[in-house]
Interface confidence: medium
């Protein structure tokens, strides 16, 4: 039994780090392998992670960690019974993948404006709480070409857009993801999407003006 692709890990900079690797053949990860991890300088126990299968030869392990400090460094030992297959280290602050935002809601009660709000996935005392920026993806369920990304570079987890920028009378979906420039993180996973019906109606004069404008072209 050998490691084909060495473990690579990402941290949510809060309480979970996820490590993935590939073996050289089909493996029952949870029964055959153990990933031991220990904070450098730690005088307590090494913690054991029981991996799960991630495809035939792939394994994934979710390492429970304490709040991350930027200088934290973990030793990682991958064992198959009494055989040490791989030894490495992992510094969570250098491999951050933020948690996905949650509670994405589309507020349509203001006739000409859509307000999208979501929740910051971190508590206020976490360093990333004040360092996340977001990307909001809005797309039409009817038209695959109607696909747009809005970058939210301010701290407030919300986005206002004019309802008129979207087609009226059709359904849209939205989702949001996050990243933090300070730790050069990867993007988070997308949040679950939310759906709404865009029922915006342009005022008559504006509607007329648009047609007139179009006619002149």
């Amino acid at each position: 039994m050998k490691v084909l692709q060495e473990p690579t890990c990402v941290s949510d900079y809060m309480s979970i780090s996820t490590c993935e690797w590939k073996m050289n053949g089909p493996t029952n990860c949870s029964t055959e392998l153990r990933l031991l991890y220990q904070l450098v300088f730690l005088l307590s126990e090494a913690h054991t992670c029981i991996p799960e299968n991630n495809g035939g030869a792939g394994c994934v392990c979710h390492l429970l960690m304490d709040d991350v400090v930027s200088a934290d460094n973990y030793t990682l030992d991958l064992w198959a019974g009494q055989q040490l297959l791989w030894k490495g280290s992992f510094k969570p602050s250098e491999h951050v993948k933020p948690r996905a935002p949650g509670n994405l809601t589309v507020h349509t009660n203001v006739s000409d404006t859509l307000l999208l709000t979501w929740s910051n996935p971190y508590p206020p005392d976490n360093y990333l709480y004040n360092h996340l920026t977001y990307a909001v993806n809005i797309w039409s369920e009817n038209d695959p070409a109607d696909f747009r990304i809005y970058n939210v570079t301010y701290l407030e987890p919300s986005l206002r857009i004019a309802a008129s920028t979207l087609k009226s009378g059709i359904s849209y979906r939205a989702r949001v993801r996050a990243w933090a420039q300070c730790y050069n993180t990867t993007w988070s996973e997308w949040s679950p999407s939310t759906k709404w019906h865009n029922s915006y109606r342009e005022p008559f004069e504006q509607h007329h003006h648009h047609h007139h404008h179009h006619h002149h072209h």
């Epitope: 904070l39 730690l42 005088l43 307590s44 126990e45 400090v69 930027s70």
Partner: antibody
Framework: EVQLVESGGGLVQPGGSLRLSCAAS????????MSWVRQAPGKGLVWVST????????SYPDSVKGRFTISRDNAKNTLYLQMNSLRAEDTAVYYC????????????WGQGTLVTVSS | DIQMTQSPSSLSASVGDRVTITCRTS??????LAWYQQKPGKAPKFLIY???TLAEGVPSRFSGSGSGTDFTLTISSLQPEDFATYYC??????????FGQGTKVEIK
């Protein structure tokens, strides 16, 4: 419930020896690092010694190095501090403490045992 | 060795007051700092670790902040049971541990 109970303190003459014990219960003793910390009357906390979970690694400040020895018996769930060549300045309450699961901070402490070095 | 300087060494305050204690280290310890509370004749109690994370069961009126070399323990509204001595302790780069000299919080 985590409990740490120190014993073995008392009055000893300068140059004498004493062995402190700390009986641990309520947690898996063999997986935790342990430490001794002392506090002279009316003074602050001073770290005295540390041992890792399997007893393979120990450390001491210069003030006690060569005179004090920390050890543990994981089968008996007991931590020890052997103190030799005692001096008047070693007079203090001695606490045993457990290291926190994730960090090298001390999350549980015993009630302490008083060591008095005096002629 | 890393030196720890706590200030003030003592302070007088009333119930309901906001109390702030500072701890300064001689070199960068990131967030590897803990705070303890000790009452007369009792063992120290673990309050805060990682400079800001409350230990289990510690009331939310306690908070910690800071990183690098400057750290603060704040009690937002002092309660009668909070009159005690408070110690900071670093745990960066063992095998040495150092405590601050303590701050005694007394009744005004």
């Amino acid at each position: 419930e985590v409990q740490l109970v120190e014993s073995g303190g008392g009055l000893v003459q300068p140059g004498g020896s004493l062995r402190l014990s700390c009986a641990a219960s309520g947690f898996t003793f063999s997986t935790y690092g342990m430490s001794w910390v002392r506090q002279a009357p009316g003074k602050g906390l001073v770290w005295v010694s540390t041992i890792n979970s399997n007893g393979g690694s120990t450390s001491y400040p210069d003030s006690v190095k060569g005179r004090f020895t920390i050890s543990r018996d994981n089968a008996k769930n007991t931590l020890y501090l052997q103190m030799n060549s005692l001096r008047a300045e070693d007079t203090a309450v001695y606490y045993c403490a457990r290291f926190f699961r994730f960090r090298n901070a001390m999350d549980y402490w015993g009630q302490g045992t008083l060591v008095t070095v005096s002629s | 060795d890393i030196q720890m300087t706590q200030s003030p060494s003592s302070l007088s305050a009333s119930v309901g007051d906001r109390v702030t204690i500072t701890c300064r280290t001689s070199e960068n310890i990131y967030s590897y700092l803990a705070w303890y509370q000790q009452k007369p004749g009792k063992a120290p109690k673990f309050l805060i670790y990682n400079a800001k994370t409350l230990a289990e069961g510690v009331p939310s009126r306690f908070s910690g902040s800071g990183s690098g070399t400057d750290f603060t323990l704040t009690i937002s509204s002092l309660q009668p049971e909070d009159f005690a001595t408070y110690y900071c302790q670093h745990y960066y780069g063992p095998p040495t541990w150092t405590f601050g000299q303590g701050t005694k919080v007394e009744i005004k």
